[in-house]
């Protein structure tokens, strides 16, 4: 039975040209995290394999930085980056957990930043 839950940063906004940390945290399970995939709709941004480290999709390699932790830092944001992002936790023996983050990239320089997510 899958008992875990994914906590995410939820809905966040950031300024065009700035950067943002996408962060998820899996809790309430003792399952072993084998891999975390970061995806946007039908696109793969990055994979963090617990043993093999990071794979960054070439289309994002100049704008994505691994971390902190299992999170992902998106840089040089454009309005086209607005949309849904998914963290997909592959775990053993539970299976797959998915978290959702909605990012809005604003033209305005007075964009409200969502509270930075801290893993305890």
């Amino acid at each position: 039975m899958m008992t875990g839950t994914i906590e995410t940063t939820g809905n966040i906004s950031a300024e065009k040209g700035g950067s943002i940390i996408l962060q998820c945290h899996l809790s309430s399970t003792t399952a072993q995290v084998t891999q975390v995939n970061w995806e946007q709709q039908d696109q793969l941004l990055a994979i963090c394999n617990a043993d093999l480290g990071w794979h960054i999709s070439p289309s994002f390699k100049d704008r994505v930085a691994p971390g902190p932790g299992l999170g992902l830092t998106l840089q040089s944001l454009t309005v086209n980056d607005t949309g849904e992002y998914f963290c997909i936790y592959h775990t053993y023996p539970d299976g797959t957990y998915t978290g959702r983050i909605f990012l809005e990239v604003l033209e305005s320089s007075v964009a409200e930043h969502g509270a930075r997510f801290q893993i305890p």
Partner: antibody, heavy 119, light 107 residues
Framework: EVQLVQSGAEVKKPGASVKISCKTS????????MHWVRQAPGKGLEWIGG????????SYNQKFKGRATLTVDKSTSTAYMELSSLRSEDTAVYYC????????????WGQGTLVTVSS | DIQLTQSPSSLSASVGDRVTITCKAS??????VAWYQQKPGKAPKLLIY???YRNTGVPSRFSGSGSGTDFTFTISSLQPEDFATYYC?????????FGQGTKLEIK
């Protein structure tokens, strides 16, 4: 120039073990994952596992877990793959292959080591 | 494990022909697919990574496309040195798996 040079062909008896080396040069060894792939005669490619030298992280294909052991010697920039309890079906060419930078595909390959298991 | 099915398994073609090989994954792998060329007695050589990116030094006649479960590898105009076996590989999740290969032969 990136190079991966593997040890020579081996003939082993069933039940024995074999240890293949893969000496690398031309790049910073600890920054790239090393994969091991095998190919039985006339057959396709099969991923055995991969190792990240900087932190020692190892991912094994479950099929080989318990029989395959991946190690590295950072001082000589050499990767090793040991396979134990050999059987005839393990007769194959074994390749080491470097994972591309921040990617899981393999951009440089060793020349291969033929392991023959025969009684 | 994710299964990759290549088609056709073998293919006869002539120099100058346009050749297409397909690779179907048993589940969504996004764009985490690579294509390799292997000649007899030699190690595989990376041609395409992340579904559509040509590796350094690979001629422009080689291309790849696709996303999700369906991928295509194309040689726009076959050259004599292109006769070999081609493999797709997924690196979306471990164990990384390969297709069974497509042997490209001279007609």
């Amino acid at each position: 120039e990136v190079q991966l040079v593997q040890s020579g062909a081996e003939v082993k008896k069933p039940g024995a073990s074999v240890k293949i080396s893969c000496k690398t040069s031309g790049y910073t060894f600890t920054e790239f994952t090393m994969h091991w792939v095998r190919q039985a005669p006339g057959k396709g490619l099969e991923w055995i596992g991969g190792l990240k030298p900087d932190n020692g992280g190892i991912s094994y294909n479950q099929k080989f877990k318990g029989r395959a052991t991946l190690t590295v010697d950072k001082s000589t920039s050499t990767a090793y793959m040991e396979l134990s309890s050999l059987r005839s079906e393990d007769t194959a060419v074994y390749y080491c292959a470097r994972g591309a930078y921040y990617r899981y595909d393999a951009d440089y390959w060793g020349q291969g080591t033929l392991v023959t298991v025969s009684s | 494990d994710i299964q990759l099915t290549q088609s056709p398994s073998s293919l006869s073609a002539s120099v100058g022909d346009r050749v297409t090989i397909t690779c179907k994954a048993s589940q969504d792998v996004k764009t985490a697919v690579a294509w390799y060329q292997q000649k007899p007695g030699k190690a595989p050589k990376l041609l395409i990574y992340s579904a559509s990116y040509r590796n350094t030094g690979v001629p422009s006649r080689f291309s790849g496309s696709g996303s999700g479960t369906d991928f295509t590898f194309t040689i726009s105009s076959l050259q004599p040195e292109d006769f070999a076996t081609y493999y797709c590989q997924q690196h979306y999740s471990t164990p990384f798996t390969f297709g069974q290969g497509t042997k490209l032969e001279i007609k």
